[in-house]
């Protein structure tokens, strides 16, 4: 019985989300293995949450909003193993925005999900950032690693995009 | 006072190349993006190239990409714009033009007097 | 390309009274509070001039009659009271994504 109403539970929030998402891919997670998380299909899965490379060239603003049609946000990295999960799914010859930005040129870092700007967990490329023009951060590879970069804004490039896992 | 102007136009052939340029002064010219921004005669402003302050970005629209290179001297306080197999299309009055950034993008706070690139046979 | 159109493609206008000019963008131009709108003047044989920056901020110099407004897609330039001066092309340009874009202009004339 219990194990009955758990499911019909799951069936009613799939087909929740099944609106906004036509397709998730889930795996079972927890002590006992009873519950369940997914990530859009085909979207890819890392700790709580998941990410989608966008390779579609679009300004920083527009990226940002095509994220959150998705309900969810240009990426906010937090770790150093977040970031080396993330690259390696981007194509070492292309750019993709992050959701930080310094929208006033004063160097007031911010990212997209409000996170608090930590220079302590920062990934920028040697000698970056360097101008306050280039208020938008992308992720690209340089020197033989992976790094940020101040762009400008407007300049359309390809994007991450980063949600919560949902829960079911 | 901030002071551009552009020189360099003239008559040229289809196929034909020239090289605009803009004096600046006024300003300190290394710490702004420049733009260069055309009209043709009875039509609406088109933006043609632009350069960042560091010289590290150039941007063009697809109708120049391959045949227009924007560049700028620094030291020199000023801008070029090389223009290579013109066509009857590129005639218009050239401007320069200076950026400034506004939050996630930029306006054209100051404009040169223009000058005029005539593409004919 | 973001399209801007603009209306009316021409106006005459008495002296005193207000010009109202409208640029629908194609797609919005603003973000989280800030629009990425400008305004431009243009006298005959001069080059474009710089009016309203960021949908409504009076570039210095210029005289207050001239006022900007708007978001997302619906922008205007307002002129009030017009002065015989101010007989020109206006145009409104777009800077939220590359390529920057132009409208088609409209005309003021004083009657």
């Known amino acids: 019985n219990f194990m009955y109403s758990k499911t019909v539970k799951r069936l009613s929030k799939l087909q929740e989300y099944q609106q906004y998402y036509p397709s998730l891919t889930c795996v079972m997670e927890g002590k006992d293995m009873e519950d369940w998380s997914c990530c859009p299909t085909p979207w890819t899965s890392f700790q709580s949450s998941c990410y989608f490379i966008s390779t579609v060239m679009q300004s920083w603003t527009k990226s940002q909003n095509n994220c959150s049609v998705m309900g969810a946000d240009l990426v906010v990295i937090n770790t150093k193993e977040e970031q080396d999960f993330i690259t390696q799914n981007l194509k070492i010859n292309s750019a993709y925005f992050l959701g930080l930005s310094d929208p006033k040129g004063w160097r007031h870092w911010q990212w997209v999900d409000q996170t608090p700007y930590n220079k302590n967990v920062t990934f920028w490329h040697s000698g970056e950032p360097n101008s306050p023009d280039e208020r938008c951060a992308i992720i690209n590879f340089r020197s033989e690693e992976w790094g940020w970069n101040d762009v400008h804004c407007h300049v359309p490039q390809k994007s991450i995009c980063k949600m919560k896992k949902i829960y079911i | 006072e901030v002071q551009l102007v552009e020189s360099g136009g003239g008559l040229v052939k289809p196929g034909g190349s020239l090289r605009l340029s803009c004096a600046a002064s006024?300003?300190?010219?290394?710490?702004?993006?420049m733009s260069w921004v055309r009209q043709a005669p009875g039509k609406r402003l088109e933006w043609v190239a632009t350069?960042?302050?560091?010289?590290?970005?150039?941007y063009y629209p697809d109708s120049v990409k391959g045949r227009f290179t924007i560049s700028r001297d620094n030291a020199k306080n000023s801008l070029y714009l090389q223009m290579n197999s013109l066509r009857a299309e590129d005639t218009a009055v050239y401007y320069c033009?200076?950026?400034?950034?506004?939050?996630?993008?930029?306006?054209?706070?100051?404009w040169g007097q223009g000058t005029t690139v005539t593409v004919s046979s | 390309d973001i399209v801007l159109t603009q209306s009316p493609a021409s106006l005459a206008v008495s002296p005193g009274q207000r010009a109202t000019i409208t640029c629908r963008a194609s797609e919005s131009v603003s973000f989280h509070g800030t629009h990425l709108m400008h305004w431009y003047q243009q006298k005959p044989g001069q080059p474009p001039k710089l009016l309203i920056y960021?949908?409504?901020n009076l570039e210095s110099g210029v005289p207050a009659r001239f006022s900007g407004s708007g978001s997302g897609t619906d922008f205007t330039l307002t002129i009030n009271p017009v002065e015989a001066e101010d007989t020109a092309n206006y145009y409104c340009q777009q800077s939220i994504e590359d390529p920057p874009t132009f409208g088609g202009g409209t005309k003021v004339e004083i009657k």
């Open positions: 960021a949908a409504s």
């Open positions: 350069i960042s302050s560091g010289d590290s970005y150039t």
């Open positions: 006024g300003f300190t010219f290394s710490s702004y993006g």
């Open positions: 033009a200076r950026q400034l950034y506004y939050s996630y993008g930029y306006y054209f706070d100051y």
